[in-house]
Interface confidence: low
Amino acid sequence: SEVEYRAEVGQNAYLPCFYTPAAPGNLVPVCWGKGACPVFECGNVVLRTDERDVNYWTSRYWLNGDFRKGDVSLTIENVTLADSGIYCCRIQIPGIMNDEKFNLKLVIKPAKVTPAPTRQRDFTAAFPRMLTTRGHGPAETQTLGSLPDINLTQISTLANELRDSRLANDLRDSGATIRIG
């Protein structure tokens, strides 16, 4: 059965997943998806890494730990009740049927106190490649929810957004861990 993790509405949720690279920097592709791990890949991918970098992520999903050392734990920013459910962390070890799959259940509880509205961010500071004009102040803000999804295969048109993210608090926990090599 899935390991269960809890967070309150408006908080950041943390879903731990680790592996030990065979050698420093010798990374294994990892995907995170919403829904239980299917036979192959991840369904409803929210974040993906390749052998060297994070190459796809969606607006509220960040890797907060040192993914270059195998900490691929997922942080979900400013959760809502809709974020409840099963999440799949899939460590895509080369070879047929070698993948390590971890299903983590996220339970979101209503906040004890009514949460503040989604925090506004200076869009220029958060995504400076999108707005090339400097000096934009707080008037040019945008909520997290409207930031675009990003895919490295679309890098020619989305390079602006690719270059930045604002990570949530530095959370650490124990969780799914495997050793590669």
């Epitope: 994070v54 993914f67 500071a125 390079a159 690719l162």
Partner: antibody, heavy 121, light 107 residues
């Protein structure tokens, strides 16, 4: 072994042009970010420009915008810095360095040895 | 642009000393700060990335920490090969900016 090798530096008169090259080996520049950073004699480090070679997406420091152009040829695994309208204050050692697309982790983990550009009449 | 104010600009220390260099960002940069070491006539070398992670191959006497917008590089026991200039850098937003450098000299 990852290596970056700059070339193309030299002495040039104010208003002149130079093209610097940064040849990468041991990794494919596609998917990384290549930065140019300069250091004037006896001074600190100043970021100049960067490029995501896969996309040709570029960024520049205000001090060089409109005068310098960064580019890359992924087939040659090489990045370039075309410097026009050079000024005395552009005199520096120019380094290329490797960075990462995910900006929160975009520290510069490999640097070239540098090439000296001297702008003087 | 984000300013990185580094201090001190220079310091004298002896082998075995504990050395601390600080950098203050003019605004929030999260953990997107790196530290580099540079020796005369050489390119900078990455020591610490994302504020506190030790780069591969760097001796464990080097460490980095963050407190809000203040960042610290610590050398727990200075070795002869550590005499050099150290730079902090923020890579949170464009343009990436460096501190002015701290020269660590032999006392």
């Amino acid at each position: 072994e990852v290596q970056l090798v700059e070339s193309g530096g030299g002495l040039v008169q104010p208003g002149g042009s130079l093209r610097l090259s940064c040849a990468a080996s041991g990794f494919n520049i596609s998917g990384y970010v290549i930065h140019w950073v300069r250091q004037a004699p006896g001074k600190g480090l100043e970021w100049v420009a960067d490029i995501i070679p896969t996309a040709g997406y570029t960024e520049y420091a205000d001090s060089v915008k409109g005068r310098f152009t960064i580019s890359a040829d992924t087939s040659k695994n090489t990045a370039y810095l075309q410097m026009n309208s050079l000024r005395a204050e552009d005199t520096a050692v120019y380094y290329c360095a490797r960075g990462y697309v995910y900006r929160m982790w975009d520290s510069f983990d490999y640097w070239g040895q540098g090439t000296l550009v001297t702008v003087s009449s | 642009d984000i300013q990185m104010t580094q201090s001190p600009s220079s310091l004298s220390a002896s082998v075995g000393d504990r050395v601390t260099i600080t950098c203050r960002a003019s605004q929030d940069v999260n953990t997107a700060v790196a530290w580099y070491q540079q020796k005369p006539g050489k390119a900078p070398k990455l020591l610490i990335y994302s504020a506190s992670f030790l780069y591969s191959g760097v001796p464990s006497r080097f460490s980095g920490s963050r407190s809000g917008t203040d960042f610290t590089l610590t050398i727990s026991s200075l070795q002869p090969e550590d005499f050099a200039t150290y730079y902090c850098q923020q890579h949170y937003t464009t343009p990436p900016t460096f501190g002015q450098g701290t020269k660590v000299e032999i006392k």
